[in-house]
């Protein structure tokens, strides 16, 4: 665990011609605030959710009123750092989006109006525990100067915040196999061992022996997906005991989407589908041009040269939404075989296989007969993730351990009586019938209807079926 810290140094007009208009005026005083969004990996496409590493919002900056005739200066900034805590290991490579927002403080009906001034994005490598890294990014005519770092929260240390340090039990040295913690040489590295069986994909631990679940997973080992199928309403906080979502107020109640956006519920919150020209969490952002970089995930921005003309994002395959911010549901093609559950992780599809199947797409039928013997000469038959014994004559049951009654199925026709025999069964036929199962009537003239009785056997004698 640790914290990503962002320090904004300045936000103002960039060098060169075409200085931007001041965002505030005497008639419309305003103040700035910033939002940072972090994603793991060097590729934005690898993000499992919009801000999978976390996001943070700054405080509001001082109120600013433009001085008539003066060029737009660096704008007054909020105090303090933006801090994004992360629970798991620091990934080492990450993508960031930093947005500069303007809050207008005029006499708007319904409170202050927000609009996006600039957005910058980048991909960086960064080791936790290192010094502050400085950066300058430009968005249109604006320039943002900032510094950032990742630091581990005690007792975690290391470039990924995955090693734990504990005070030494002995003054001279650490225990067997444990190294001193640099730079805390008076502390020792402690192995972090989660509870046995804790899911490496959906669980994590901050203390040895625990297993804490990522959102969407439950159970003692975080192996049970939170299900809404047996619940009345897919809303509200999850219950760790049932894996159900308890009814609560709906996130779309009252439609939080502005500017004609339509609201749809998601497992975690809500999602607005915005009309063209608007975007943001609640479709509240407008007046955006291609210079603001509104298209995510490598989308190509067309048009929108000035705030009065709408831009269009041409999304790369696999992305959609007015700003290419949404991933297409690839699981709808049902790529997982044999009843496997499909999970779209963004950078890849994963299949959670049913018992008895394995492989990336659950394509391998595990050898269910391995180590399972069928008794009394029976043979094992695989199928559907379970095993079945095909038993030798005279035996039955799951493992062919039960002696079968060959007469149970009443195999003797036309009222013949069945007798169990060591090699099968014997039918004693009623008068007028013959054959191994008494299936052939005997004609009055003494000739049988089908095969003749074998030599030495009279009609009516018991026929032994082998």
């Amino acid at each position: 665990a640790g914290v990503f810290e962002l320090q904004i140094h300045s936000f103002g007009p960039g060098p060169g011609p075409g200085a931007p208009r001041s965002p505030c005026s005497a008639r419309l005083p305003c103040r700035l605030f910033f939002r940072v969004c972090l994603k793991p990996g060097l590729s934005e496409e690898a993000a499992e959710s919009p801000c999978a590493l976390g996001a943070a919002l700054s405080a509001r900056g001082p109120v600013y009123t433009e001085q008539p005739g003066a060029p737009a200066p660096d704008l007054p900034l909020p105090d303090g750092l933006l801090q994004v805590p992360f629970r798991d290991a620091w990934p080492g490579t990450f993508s960031f989006i930093i947005e500069t927002w303007r809050e207008e403080l005029g006499d708007q009906i319904g409170g202050p109006a927000w609009s996006l001034l600039a957005r910058v994005a980048g991909r960086r490598r960064l080791a936790a525990g290192g010094p502050w890294a400085r950066d300058i990014q430009r968005a249109g005519a604006w320039e943002l100067r900032f510094s950032y770092r990742a630091r581990c929260e005690p007792p975690a240390v290391g470039t990924a915040c995955t090693r734990l340090c504990r005070p030494r039990s002995a003054p001279s040295r650490c225990g067997p196999g444990l190294r001193p913690c640099a730079p805390l040489e008076d502390e020792c590295e402690a192995p972090l061992v989660c509870r046995a069986g804790c899911s490496p994909e959906h669980g994590f631990c901050e203390q040895p022996g625990e297993c804490r679940c990522l959102e969407g997973w439950t159970g003692p080992l975080c192996t049970v997906p939170v299900s809404t199928s047996s619940c009345l309403s897919p809303r509200g906080p999850s219950s760790a005991t049932t894996g159900c979502l308890v009814p609560g107020p709906g996130p779309c109640d009252g439609n939080p989407c502005a500017n004609g956006g339509s609201c749809s519920e998601t497992p975690r919150s809500f999602e607005c589908t915005c009309p063209r020209g608007f975007y943001g969490l609640r479709c509240e952002v407008s007046g955006v041009t291609c210079a603001d970089g509104p298209c995510f995930n490598g989308g190509l921005c067309v048009g929108g040269a000035d705030p009065d003309s709408a831009y269009i994002c041409h999304c790369p395959p696999g992305f959609q939404g007015s700003n290419c911010e949404k991933r297409v549901d690839r699981c709808s093609l049902q790529p997982c075989r044999n009843g496997g559950l499909c999970l779209d992780l963004g950078h890849a599809l994963r299949c959670r296989c049913r018992a008895g199947f394995a492989g990336p797409r659950c394509e391998h039928d595990l050898d269910d007969c391995a180590g399972r013997a069928c008794a009394n000469g029976g043979t094992c038959v695989e199928g559907g993730g379970a095993h079945r014994c095909s038993c030798a004559l005279g035996f039955g049951g799951r493992d062919c351990r039960e002696r079968a009654d060959p007469c149970a199925a009443r195999p003797c026709a036309h009222g013949g009586r069945c007798y169990a025999h060591f090699s099968g069964l014997v039918c004693a036929c009623a008068p007028g019938y013959m054959g191994a199962r008494c299936e052939f009537p005997v004609h009055p003239d003494g000739a049988s209807a089908l095969p003749a009785a074998p030599p030495g056997l009279r009609p009516g004698d018991p026929q032994r079926y082998l």
């Epitope: 093609l333 049902q334 790529p335 797409r361």
Partner: nanobody
Framework: EVQLVESGGGEVQPGGSLRLSCAAS????????MGWYRQAPGKQRELVAG???????IYAESVKGRFTISRDNAKNTVYLQMSSLRAEDTAVYYC??????????????WGQGTLVTVKP
Amino acid sequence: EVQLVESGGGEVQPGGSLRLSCAASGSIFSINAMGWYRQAPGKQRELVAGFTGDTNTIYAESVKGRFTISRDNAKNTVYLQMSSLRAEDTAVYYCAADVQLFSRDYEFYWGQGTLVTVKP
């Protein structure tokens, strides 16, 4: 690298028919699942029809009885026969495939899309 190339899109009158085809090429060991999605202006991309990993055929409710998906395994090609077309079928149609590469890894690929316009 794998390429999906769609063809067969165009303009047609309501009630008319079109046949889309999508050919997969490249370092393909096998095709696990393959099908068609579509995206109408201002709408989300949705599955139209496909062959699942278990080789079952699936269809969106809105196209059942009108569209038929078929495949030619030897050519790594999937087809979408669209009949009784309606104005609401107007969209860009994308081919999609879940492919096992020679490395035995699985990757999901998209075509560039082909436009189908239904108007009187």
